[in-house]
Interface confidence: medium
């Protein structure tokens, strides 16, 4: 793992404990909470990051859905179960034996049940829509410049292959970034769109997960792009299964 040798830290994940106890005295970093070894040359999985983050859950809020099957993370934070590769286990349960199924970004996609609840597979989130509203500026941003800057950000900061940034839409003051990545498209070593979206979300909130790097300073042709609010919608390869009661609530 390419953790910084001199001071033995993980550039892509500050929520780690690092020590030079790897093969040949190399720096090895383990995620807080799970103790799993992480690859510091790329993004850490969202599951391990959530596991490491021990803060109180955020209040639920009903939000806009871009389609009847779109999910929004209304449940906030929880302490997830991750598999040996750091992915979310399809079934998540809390300490009171209440269980539910999640998608590949850890968002609940079924009603809650008891320990008998079955989640046959981890359903992939193949389309993520990041909806941002920017603070007022003297004028609208140039769409082409905005598009280029956001694509550069996902490529350089989050190491997401450009082909997975499907589109950047702009209608002042709203920006929508569409990330798309089917199971068949994702090759070994590719950053997952769910992980990239999570790092971006934390960056936007001023809670950067990167070690030692300054916070996100987004600029379009020198003009600061300051985000007022963010909504993230998740669309799964298989539509979620909720009772009608929840869908009409």
């Amino acid at each position: 793992h390419t953790a910084a040798q001199d001071n033995c830290t993980c550039p892509t994940n500050k929520m780690t404990v690092c020590s030079p106890d790897g093969p040949g005295g190399r720096c090895q970093c383990r995620a807080l909470g799970s103790g799993m070894a992480v690859d510091c040359s790329t993004l850490t999985s969202k599951c391990l990051l959530l596991k490491a983050r021990m803060s109180a859950p955020k209040n639920a809020r009903t939000l806009v859905r871009p389609s009847e099957h779109a999910l929004v993370d209304n449940d906030g934070l929880y302490d997830p179960d991750c598999d040996p590769e750091g992915r979310f286990k399809a079934r998540q349960c809390n300490q009171t034996s209440v269980c539910w199924c999640v998608n590949s970004v850890g968002v609940r996609r079924t009603d809650k049940g008891d320990l008998s609840l079955r989640c046959d597979e981890l359903v992939r989130t193949h389309h993520i829509l990041i909806d941002l509203r920017h603070r007022p500026t003297a004028g609208a941003f140039n769409h082409s410049d905005l598009d280029a800057e956001l694509r550069r950000l996902f490529r350089e900061r989050y190491r997401l292959h450009p082909k997975f940034v499907a589109a950047v839409h702009y209608e002042q003051p709203t920006i929508q970034i569409e990330l798309r990545q089917n199971t068949s498209q994702k090759a070994a070593g590719d950053v997952d769109i769910g992980d990239a979206a999570y790092y971006f979300e934390r960056d936007i909130k001023g809670e950067s997960l990167f070690q030692g790097r300054g916070g996100l300073d987004l600029r379009v042709r020198g003009e600061p792009l300051q985000v007022e609010r963010t909504l993230i919608y998740y669309l799964d390869e298989i539509p979620p299964k909720f009772s009608m009661k929840r869908l009409t609530a």
């Epitope: 806009v64 829509l129 509203r133 609208a140 769409h143 702009y170 209608e171 003051p173 709203t174």
Partner: antibody
Framework: EVQLQQSGPELLKPGASVKISCKAS????????MHWVKQSHGKSLEWIGG????????NYNEKFKDKATLTVDESSSTAYMELRSLTSEDSAVYYC??????????????WGTGTTVTVSS | DIQMTQSPASLSASVGETVTITCRAS??????LAWYQQKQGKSPQLLVY???TLADGVPSRFSGSGSGTQYSLKINSLQPEDFGSYYC?????????FGSGTKLEIK
């Protein structure tokens, strides 16, 4: 069936204010932004502004910024437009129309029934 | 702000004829253009969006085309119910301006 039902005609004196309503039915109110359009007699259409129901975020045409105020009441799936300091120039038919929140799909797919506002002394 | 120049202002045609209405934007609107039909005393109705996509329930005799700054709406084999006013509207950036309209009348 998706419908946008607007309030009835208004006859007002110059300097007065009026609040027009647009009640949505047949769809999830918060999945769409609500926009308002002015059509003066025998003339073209003018976009006044739009509102994002979840947050009350508004977007106005500069021309109407001091004239119109857009609000929504999510509980009743109703959008409102208040027009103030009315003059004869404000006499027109006003339409509400909806637009999906998805920016890759941009159009007004459903229009309200229209509200006629007449300003006369 | 982007201005929309629509032409012609009025047009007389007979049932069965083909007509074309054009809209020119003052800047590139990247195909974010919609066309509406409005009958006398009625609300506008969506015909075409994203420059070329026909709205649900719109007959196939209507078609949209164009890119960049130049767009057009073509109506093949005019039917009696097609007469009325037509408006284009861009959605590239706010304000979402409309064209001045084209009144299509029976010859």
């Amino acid at each position: 069936e998706v419908q946008l039902q607007q309030s009835g005609p208004e006859l007002l004196k110059p300097g007065a204010s009026v609040k027009i309503s647009c009640k949505a039915s047949g769809y999830t109110f918060t999945d769409y932004t609500m926009h308002w359009v002015k059509q003066s007699h025998g003339k073209s259409l003018e976009w006044i502004g739009g509102i994002y129901p979840n947050y009350g975020d508004t977007n106005y045409n500069e021309k109407f910024k001091d004239k119109a105020t857009l609000t929504v009441d999510e509980s009743s799936s109703t959008a409102y437009m208040e027009l103030r300091s009315l003059t004869s120039e404000d006499s027109a038919v006003y339409y509400c129309s909806r637009k999906t929140v998805l920016l890759r799909l941009r159009y007004f797919d459903v229009w309200g029934t229209g509200t006629t506002v007449t300003v006369s002394s | 702000d982007i201005q929309m120049t629509q032409s012609p202002a009025s047009l007389s045609a007979s049932v069965g004829e083909t007509v074309t209405i054009t809209c020119r934007a003052s800047g590139n609107i990247h195909n974010y253009l919609a066309w509406y039909q409005q009958k006398q005393g009625k609300s506008p109705q969506l015909l075409v969006y994203n420059a070329i996509t026909l709205a649900d329930g719109v007959p196939s005799r209507f078609s949209g085309s164009g890119s960049g700054t130049q767009y057009s709406l073509k109506i093949n084999s005019l039917q009696p119910e097609d007469f009325g006013s037509y408006y284009c509207q861009h959605f590239w950036s706010t304000p979402f301006t409309f064209g001045s309209g084209t009144k299509l009348e029976i010859k």
